[in-house]
C-alpha cells in the first residue's frame, strides 16, 4: 500500500476502561496530531478506518462491527464499546485516508477489572481540596457524551467501599460531591457510579478519584527559615568540616514552585572556586506543607572561608526571604605556661 504518515504508538494516551462498562474512545489523530477536526476531514472525502492488535499478538486485524447488540460500533471519530470485555485489551489504530492522503496513530487500550470496593489497577486522578476552606466540590469525571441530556442518570457516590449517605460534612449532589468542610479524615478514594438506560439496557459508568486534603491558601505564609538563625553560631577552626543546614518551611500553595538556595559572598556556590557540596532533603506534612533542608558542606574549611558571608535564600509564590548564617573562626584557647622562678632565695 502507499505511504502513510504513521504517528506510531501514542503511549501518552494509555487508556484504561473498566470491564463490562461502556467506553467511548476518540481517535487521537484529531485531538493531538492533525490541525483539522473530523467534520472537516469527512467533508473533504477522507474515511476513518479502525483496526486493532490483540494483547500479546503482532497481527493487525479489523474490528468486528457486526457483534450482537452492536457491542462495538463507530460514530464519527469515536469508537464505542457497549460494553467492554476483558479481551478487548490491545493496541487500537485509527487511520484517516483517501486515495492521496493517509495518516494513522495507534494507542493502547487496557480493560481492567475492579472488585466490589472499586479497587483496580486503574491509575486514579488526584483532586486536591483545601482544608477547612468552605464548600468545595469534586465532579464525576469523564462521563460526557455517554448519554443525551434528556436522559437523567442516577448517581451514587462512595468513599472507599461505603455509600455516602451518612456523612455530616459531605453531600452527594448528582454529578457533584460537595464537601462542606474538608478535613484530613476526608482523604481517600471517592467513586461515582452513574447508571443510565439505553435501548432497553442499563449501563453503569464507574469513576474513581483520589481526594487529598491540602493546606488552605487562607493559612498560607511566605517561606519561613528555621535555620540558620540568630541562636546558632557555626564556630570552626581551619581544617575542620563546616556544615550549615538551611531548613525552610513552605505552606502548601497550588502550583507553586518552592526554591531554596545558598549564596556565598553573594554568589551561587557553582560560581565560586571553593569546594562546596550541597545536599537537599524534602519532607511533607499531611496537608502537603513542605520542609526543605539544604546542607552546605565544606570538608576542610580555611580561615578565608570562615570570613565569608553564607546566606540561605527561599522563594515561593508567597514571597522571598533570606537569612545569613553566623560563621566565625574559633579563637584558640590561651595556652597557660608555668614559669619556674629560681634564685629568689633570701640572702
Amino acid at each position: 500500500s502507499e505511504r502513510c504518515d504513521d504517528w506510531g504508538l501514542d503511549t501518552m494516551r494509555q487508556i484504561q476502561v473498566f470491564e463490562d462498562e461502556p467506553a467511548r474512545i476518540k481517535c487521537p489523530l484529531f485531538e493531538h496530531f492533525l490541525k483539522f477536526n473530523y467534520s472537516t476531514a469527512h467533508s473533504a472525502g477522507l474515511t476513518l478506518i479502525w483496526y486493532w492488535t490483540r494483547q500479546d499478538r503482532d497481527l493487525e486485524e479489523p474490528i468486528n462491527f457486526r457483534l450482537p447488540e452492536n457491542r462495538i460500533s463507530k460514530e464519527k471519530d469515536v469508537l464505542w464499546f457497549r460494553p467492554t470485555l476483558l479481551n478487548d485489551t490491545g493496541n487500537y489504530t485509527c487511520m484517516l485516508r483517501n486515495t492521496t492522503y493517509c495518516s494513522k496513530v495507534a494507542f493502547p487500550l487496557e480493560v481492567v477489572q475492579k472488585d466490589s470496593c472499586f479497587n483496580s489497577p486503574m491509575k486514579l486522578p488526584v483532586h486536591k481540596l483545601y482544608i477547612e476552606y468552605g464548600i468545595q466540590r469534586i465532579t464525576c469525571p469523564n462521563v460526557d457524551g455517554y448519554f443525551p441530556s434528556s436522559v437523567k442518570p442516577t448517581i451514587t457516590w462512595y468513599m472507599g467501599c461505603y455509600k455516602i449517605q451518612n456523612f455530616n460534612n459531605v453531600i452527594p449532589e448528582g454529578m457533584n460531591l460537595s464537601f462542606l468542610i474538608a478535613l484530613i479524615s476526608n482523604n481517600g478514594n471517592y467513586t461515582c457510579v452513574v447508571t443510565y438506560p439505553e435501548n432497553g439496557r442499563t449501563f453503569h459508568l464507574t469513576r474513581t478519584l483520589t481526594v487529598k486534603v491540602v493546606g488552605s491558601p487562607k493559612n498560607a505564609v511566605p517561606p519561613v527559615i528555621h535555620s540558620p538563625n540568630d541562636h546558632v553560631v557555626y564556630e570552626k577552626e581551619p581544617g575542620e568540616e563546616l556544615l550549615i543546614p538551611c531548613t525552610v518551611y513552605f505552606s502548601f500553595l497550588m502550583d507553586s514552585r518552592n526554591e531554596v538556595w545558598w549564596t556565598i559572598d553573594g554568589k551561587k556556590p557553582d560560581d565560586i572556586t571553593i569546594d562546596v557540596t550541597i545536599n537537599e532533603s524534602i519532607s511533607h506534612s499531611r496537608t502537603e506543607d513542605e520542609t526543605r533542608t539544604q546542607i552546605l558542606s565544606i570538608k576542610k574549611v580555611t580561615s578565608e572561608d570562615l570570613k565569608r558571608s553564607y546566606v540561605c535564600h527561599a522563594r515561593s509564590a508567597k514571597g522571598e526571604v533570606a537569612k545569613a548564617a553566623k560563621v566565625k573562626q574559633k579563637v584558640p584557647a590561651p595556652r597557660y605556661t608555668v614559669e619556674l622562678a629560681c634564685g629568689f632565695g633570701a640572702t
Partner: antibody, heavy 120, light 113 residues
C-alpha cells in the same frame, strides 16, 4: 447516655440580649458534629437558626440570623451557645439544639428546648 | 434559598389508613431530604434521612421516596401513636455562591378522623 440539654431561656424586653446554652453529654465536641440551634414559634413550624462544626468551629447561619445571632462552642465544657442581640417580639420561640441537622445523619439528636419570650 | 412546600397542611385519617405526605423543593436537592415527627410539647424525632433511609428504631410502616424536587413520606398503616405533625427538611449547596441552603417544610398535621 447521649443527650443535649438547653438552658438560658427567659423573658426579655425588645432590644435586649440573651445567651442560650446547650450542654452535651455522652459524646465529645472534639469529634466531628454539626450542632445547630433550631427555633419554633408558638403554634408554628421549625426554623433553623445557626450551626457550628464542633471540631473546627466553622459556622453556618440562616440568612436572617446573620449579624444579630452568634453561635459558639466551648469544647472543654462540651457546651454550645447562642448569643442573641437586639431581640424582637418575633424571636419569641422554643429554642432547640440539635446534633447533625445541617446535613441530617443517623446521629441526629435533639434537646428538649428552652423558651425565649420577647415582650415588654 | 430553597423553599420546601409540604402538602397537605393537615389531614384527618383513621387508624389503619395509608397516609401520604408530599414535600416539594423549589430546586433540585437530589436525595438530601429528611422527615421528622413532632408531638405536642416534645422535640422533633428523625424518621427518614437521605430521602429513603429509615432511622434506627423507626417502625417499618414509615417509608420515604423521591429525589430531585418531589418527595413522599408514606405511613402504610396509621397507628394511634402516629398522630403528630410531620416536617420535611431539605439541604443543598449553591455552586455560584458556595452557600449552603437548608429549609424545613411548614409541617403537616395528622389528626384523628
Amino acid at each position: 447516655q447521649v443527650q443535649l440539654q438547653e438552658s438560658g431561656g427567659d423573658l426579655v424586653q425588645p432590644g435586649g440580649s440573651l445567651r442560650l446554652s446547650c450542654a452535651a453529654s455522652g459524646f465529645s465536641f472534639s469529634s466531628n458534629y454539626w450542632i445547630c440551634w433550631v427555633r419554633q414559634a408558638p403554634g408554628k413550624g421549625l426554623e433553623l437558626v445557626a450551626c457550628i462544626y464542633t471540631s473546627t468551629g466553622n459556622t453556618w447561619y440562616a440568612s436572617w440570623a446573620k449579624g444579630r445571632f452568634t453561635i459558639s462552642r466551648d469544647n472543654s465544657k462540651n457546651t454550645l451557645y447562642l448569643q442573641m442581640n437586639s431581640l424582637r417580639a418575633e424571636d419569641t420561640a422554643v429554642y432547640f439544639c440539635a446534633r447533625d441537622l445541617l446535613v441530617v445523619t443517623s446521629f441526629n439528636l435533639w434537646g428538649q428546648g428552652t423558651l425565649v419570650t420577647v415582650s415588654s | 434559598d430553597i423553599v420546601m412546600t409540604q402538602s397537605p397542611s393537615s389531614l384527618s385519617a383513621s387508624v389503619g389508613d395509608r397516609v401520604t405526605i408530599t414535600c416539594q423543593a423549589s430546586e433540585d436537592i437530589y436525595s438530601n431530604l429528611a422527615w421528622f415527627q413532632q408531638k405536642p410539647g416534645q422535640a422533633p424525632k428523625l424518621l427518614i434521612y437521605g430521602a429513603s433511609t429509615l432511622a434506627s428504631g423507626v417502625p417499618s410502616r414509615f417509608s420515604g421516596s423521591g429525589s430531585g424536587t418531589e418527595f413522599t413520606l408514606t405511613i402504610s398503616s396509621l397507628q394511634p401513636e402516629d398522630f403528630a405533625t410531620y416536617y420535611c427538611l431539605g439541604v443543598c449547596t449553591d455552586i455560584s455562591t458556595d452557600d449552603l441552603y437548608n429549609a424545613f417544610g411548614q409541617g403537616t398535621k395528622v389528626v384523628i378522623k
